[in-house]
């Protein structure tokens, strides 16, 4: 039985040209996290494997950085980066947990988001 829950940064916004950290946290389960996949629609952004470390998809290598922790940092944001992002936690023995984050990239300097998820 899957007892875990994923907490995410929820709906966030950031300025065009800036950076943002996408964070998820799996709690309320003793399941072992074997891998975390970060995705945007049908695109795989990155994989964090518990044994093998990080793989950033080549399409995103120039603007995506691993971490902090199991999170993902998006850099040089454009308005095209607006949309849904998913963290997929592959766990044993529970199976798969999915978290959703909506990112809005704003043209102006009025972007508001939690400071702890922003890269200065």
């Amino acid at each position: 039985m899957m007892t875990g829950t994923i907490e995410t940064t929820g709906n966030i916004s950031a300025e065009k040209g800036g950076s943002i950290i996408l964070q998820c946290h799996l709690s309320s389960t003793t399941a072992q996290v074997t891998q975390v996949n970060w995705e945007q629609q049908d695109q795989l952004l990155a994989i964090c494997n518990a044994d093998l470390g990080w793989h950033i998809s080549p399409s995103f290598k120039d603007r995506v950085a691993p971490g902090p922790g199991l999170g993902l940092t998006l850099q040089s944001l454009t308005v095209n980066d607006t949309g849904e992002y998913f963290c997929i936690y592959h766990t044993y023995p529970d199976g798969t947990y999915t978290g959703r984050i909506f990112l809005e990239v704003l043209e102006s300097s009025v972007a508001e988001h939690g400071a702890r998820f922003q890269i200065p």
Epitope: E39, Q43, D51, L52, H55, S59
Partner: antibody, heavy 120, light 107 residues
Framework: EVQLQESGPGLVKPSETLSLTCAVS????????WNWIRQPPGKKLEYIGY???????YYNPSLKSRVTISRDTSKNQFSLKLSSVTAADTAVYYC??????????????WGQGTTVTVSS | DIVMTQTPLSLSVTPGQPASISCKAS??????VAWYQQKPGQSPQLMIY???YRYTGVPDRFSGSGSGTDFTLKISRVEAEDVGVYYC?????????FGGGTKVEIK
């Protein structure tokens, strides 16, 4: 250049343990991931498991109860043990390297393969 | 486990003509797909990773495409040296799994 060479008996009796070694040259096994993959005659390639740069192991759940992958860093080699073999374990066994950071789970260097037959 | 299904099983192509191999995943694997070529008597060789990126030294007549569940390996102009078996593989989640292979022959 990375080179991998499998060695071990070509014939194993049913219920015994299959033991293979992969000697690696041109690269240290304390980097990247070191894998075993097999191909039974007329069947798909089957992923057996890996030992990571840090010595952590992953085994395909379908074989997990029978498989052990270990390494000897002083000899720059890693090994496969598969216990309680049956005719279904007859296959070409490949050792291989995987550079997870650059290529994800895509295997970039393979040994030439060694044929193991399980028969009395 | 994710099942990778390749079609066709075999393919006979005239030199200089194109060839196309399909691979279908039993669930969404995004772009975590690789393609390998196995020439007769040799071990598999990585051709494509991340669905569409050519590995070092792979001729540009080879291309990969697709995302989600449907993937394609194309050879724009088949040459005699391209004979062999081609395999797809998913690495979206463990256990990493392979397709059954497509044998490419020359007419």
């Amino acid at each position: 250049e990375v080179q991998l060479q499998e060695s071990g008996p070509g014939l194993v009796k049913p219920s015994e343990t299959l033991s293979l070694t992969c000697a690696v040259s041109g690269y240290s096994i304390t980097s990247d991931s070191w894998n075993w993959i097999r191909q039974p005659p007329g069947k798909k390639l089957e992923y057996i498991g890996y030992i990571s740069y840090s010595g952590n192991t992953y085994y395909n759940p379908s074989l997990k109860s029978r498989v052990t992958i270990s390494r000897d860093t002083s000899k720059n080699q890693f090994s496969l043990k598969l216990s309680s073999v049956t005719a279904a374990d007859t296959a070409v066994y490949y050792c291989a390297r995987l550079d997870f950071s650059n290529y994800g789970g895509a295997v970039d260097y393979w040994g030439q393969g060694t044929t193991v037959t399980v028969s009395s | 486990d994710i099942v990778m299904t390749q079609t066709p099983l075999s393919l006979s192509v005239t030199p200089g003509q194109p060839a196309s191999i399909s691979c279908k995943a039993s669930q969404n694997v995004r772009t975590a797909v690789a393609w390998y070529q196995q020439k007769p008597g040799q071990s598999p060789q990585l051709m494509i990773y991340s669905a569409s990126y050519r590995y070092t030294g792979v001729p540009d007549r080879f291309s990969g495409s697709g995302s989600g569940t449907d993937f394609t390996l194309k050879i724009s102009r088949v040459e005699a040296e391209d004979v062999g078996v081609y395999y797809c593989q998913q690495y979206y989640t463990t256990p990493w799994t392979f397709g059954g292979g497509t044998k490419v022959e020359i007419k």
